[in-house]
């Protein structure tokens, strides 16, 4: 899995989207979890409604909300009143039984100030053997959001 970087500004809201194949993941609940260490489990933050048909209903845990468009195949996580503590590595997951498939790895970065936005080149960071030419960077800048695909070193 590549990792997508989402940058938000402290005090504002940040929306993270995780697209997926709606047919492949039909009937499956979703979750948002945080990787606190290089090894070890992904710690569950919030999951969609216990009844899959009600997955469109927004569920909150503290300042984090999750909602699932099961037809369109987009899981959306909202981090309200973004704080430094929210920075970190997360995963969007699709749940089946006691197992979980990773839909997307997400790196959340919290900026102190909109002026701290960097150019796209700064969003890339190399794995062990990648060169800059190999990096594929997408980015879209709004007042409080910057998103880009970046390669990611192994977490195991």
């Amino acid at each position: 899995h590549n990792t997508t970087v989402f940058q938000g500004v402290a005090g504002q809201s940040l929306q993270v989207s995780c697209p997926y194949d709606s047919m492949k993941h039909w009937g499956r609940r979703k979750a948002w979890c945080r990787q606190l260490g290089e090894k070890g489990p992904c710690q569950r933050v919030v999951s969609t409604h216990n009844l899959w048909l009600l997955s469109f209903l927004r569920r909150w845990n503290g300042s984090t909300a999750i909602t699932d468009d099961t037809l369109g195949g987009t899981l959306t996580i909202t981090l309200r009143n973004l704080q430094p503590h929210d920075a970190g590595l997360y995963q969007c997951q699709s749940l089946h039984g006691s197992e979980a498939d990773t839909l997307r790895k997400v790196l959340v970065e919290v900026l102190a100030d909109p002026l701290d936005h960097r150019d796209a080149g700064d969003l890339w960071f190399p794995g062990e053997s990648e060169s800059f030419e190999d990096a594929h960077v997408e980015h879209s800048i709004s007042r409080s959001l910057l998103e880009g695909e970046i390669p990611f070193p192994p977490t195991s």
Partner: antibody, heavy 123, light 112 residues
Amino acid sequence: QVQLQQSGAELARPGASVKLSCKASGYTFTSYALSWVKQRTGQGLEWIGEIYPRSGNTYSNEKFKGKATLTADKSSSTAYMELRSLTSEDSAVYFCAKGGVYYGSSYWYFDVWGTGTTVTVSS
Amino acid sequence: DVVMTQTPLSLPVSLGDQASISCSSSQSLVHSNGNTYLHWYLQKPGQSPKLLIYKVSNRFSGVPDRFSGTESGTDFTLKISRVEAEDLGVYFCSQSTHVPLTFGAGTKLELK
């Protein structure tokens, strides 16, 4: 093991600038935030700010904006703090400290502290 | 800024005693994510601080179980059940719930 080796003591004139370094080893430098903390002789600790070495993004204490600039060099796994327009108030020991959470803010907690650098400002 | 008030500033003890250090915050340290970011560090003479307890009561790896942390509202306590010689130094509490991160003035644990 995880270590943060800081540069040697600095003696500077009022109005001058100094650049302190903090070389990280024993972990993936870009995976953890690094903070800088000031300790004046016989006094408490003051948080200056933090840097995410992966992106270069910084998060600072308003009190130190204009005083301290944080940077990081990924190739050498070294973080830097430049202090400018030095006055006697800047005479202190400065520590770098590693955040304890993977790709997270050092706001969670500092799990490893550097050796410290003494800065003396005197004419 | 959140003010962290530590008491006492000096705590004379005998080896084997129980020691208790208090830290009070000027506002609640409960973050919107449910965590309470109150930590304890020990700085031995001539050394860098070291993490003892994070998030109120979690002992950092390698920290002996004679150290424990508790909370009651905005009041926090670090307890050392039986003081050993290696425990002597200055103890700092720190809050990192609010920006900027702040520290207490420190409590010096010393021999009577």
